[in-house]
Interface confidence: low
Amino acid sequence: SAHAHPRDSCPLGPGRCCHLETVQATLEDLGWSDWVLSPRQLQLSMCVGECPHLYRSANTHAQIKARLHGLQPDKVPAPCCVPSSYTPVVLMHRTDSGVSLQTYDDLVARGCHCA
Amino acid sequence: SAHAHPRDSCPLGPGRCCHLETVQATLEDLGWSDWVLSPRQLQLSMCVGECPHLYRSANTHAQIKARLHGLQPDKVPAPCCVPSSYTPVVLMHRTDSGVSLQTYDDLVARGCHCA
């Protein structure tokens, strides 16, 4: 059917397929040191790794893409590893009137899939 | 700010950056010929192309990813081109009792961004 079960075991070996990783970044790395006050460092969860055939397919489109990539690799790219959900993060930043806390809903990944 | 405007003109030249492209596929290509009756071929819109720095960033996470990729290309992958929205598609398929029409909401891409 169109909704074949996405495969969840990595055929490429441990840690090679699409998964969540933590990357350390400072405000300077992000170019935010002039407006974000805190935290001074962020542990940013990101989606990395390869998307072999049907691994963690996001949806029907991703399954089709995987299949057509196998047939026409020059025309159709393989699915790639992107966030499926996010974790809210609070940043304290400067405002004209002082400082404020603001929640960013789309800053740190919480889960990954192949799209 | 965290919400810098995503860049919308492609610095790599026409057609090189993340965009929607139509790929023609038959039911045989998709492995669906045994259960889908119609249409016999599909014009599948897919997202293809590169995601240079800040091009069509999906959200704050994608902007961060682009920046950190520039700083640590071995550790952090570049954003990649994936669907931002989908177009519903109706397929006629076989059932135990005959045929039925079913709408698939996540089969054909309608828009693309870099995530």
């Epitope: 933590t22 350390q24 805190s38 542990q43 969860s45 609070v90 304290m92 806390l101 | 640590q72 550790k75």
Partner: antibody, heavy 119, light 107 residues
Framework: QVQLVQSGAEVKKPGASVKVSCKAS????????INWVRQAPGQGLEWMGW????????NYAQKLQGRVTMTTDTSTSTAYMELRSLRSDDTAVYYC????????????WGQGTMVTVSS | DIQLTQSPSSVSASVGDRVTITCRAS??????LAWYQQKPGKAPKLLIY???SLQSGVPSRFSGSGSGTDFTLTISSLQPEDFATYYC?????????FGGGTKVEIK
């Protein structure tokens, strides 16, 4: 369940080195960092440093810089902390702890490894 | 480095008492502060993260509050199992630092 299991107690002479291991289970090892924290007898908690299991990025406490090395082996989901040129004031319980998360809070701790430095 | 000063260093209290522990940072860290409980011979246990968020599985008698440089851990009704040492920890920047600890003893 999420667990961090540390290697056993060690007795070392001044000037020697010690390497403590910390084996993780019950979660995706590379999705988190590992903190190392020590506690001298009757004293408070002292943060030693942090390593991200994915990339091997480290950040060490200034006072231990040059004497401490933190590493991970992703194939066995194990973190290691090596401390060189041991002194008597390095006698402590050494803890590994999962984190930091976004807020650097440490939610899961190992059981601790007692390292005694004595001549 | 950010210094954390905890007070009091020890407190004697009875079961059912309300206990308040404060933690003052040498510079603003809001809301990147956590609280831990440690019992003798055991590893610390996370109680509160991000200044006021209760860690899963921790009883609701524990609460955290505060912002900027001043933070508070409150135990609303002390239970026998709460006699322990409590530490605050800042997570705003490396090096991560802990407060000196507050020992909660039986009166």
């Amino acid at each position: 369940q999420v667990q961090l299991v540390q290697s056993g107690a060690e007795v070392k002479k001044p000037g020697a080195s010690v390497k403590v291991s910390c084996k993780a289970s019950g979660y995706t090892f590379t999705s988190y960092g590992i903190n190392w924290v020590r506690q001298a007898p009757g004293q408070g908690l002292e943060w030693m440093g942090w390593i991200t299991a994915y990339s091997g990025d480290t950040n060490y406490a200034q006072k231990l810089q040059g004497r401490v090395t933190m590493t991970t082996d992703t194939s066995t989901s194990t973190a290691y902390m090596e401390l060189r040129s041991l002194r008597s004031d390095d006698t402590a319980v050494y803890y590994c702890a999962r984190g930091p998360g976004q807020y650097a809070d440490v939610d899961v701790w190992g059981q601790g490894t007692m390292v005694t430095v004595s001549s | 480095d950010i210094q954390l000063t905890q007070s009091p260093s020890s407190v004697s209290a009875s079961v059912g008492d309300r206990v308040t522990i404060t933690c003052r940072a040498s510079q603003g860290i809001s809301p990147w502060l956590a609280w831990y409980q440690q019992k003798p011979g055991k590893a610390p246990k996370l109680l509160i993260y991000a200044a006021s968020s209760l860690q899963s599985g921790v009883p609701s008698r524990f609460s955290g509050s505060g912002s900027g440089t001043d933070f508070t851990l409150t135990i609303s009704s002390l239970q026998p199992e709460d006699f322990a040492t409590y530490y605050c920890q800042q997570a705003n920047s490396f090096p991560i630092t802990f407060g000196g600890g507050t020992k909660v003893e039986i009166k």
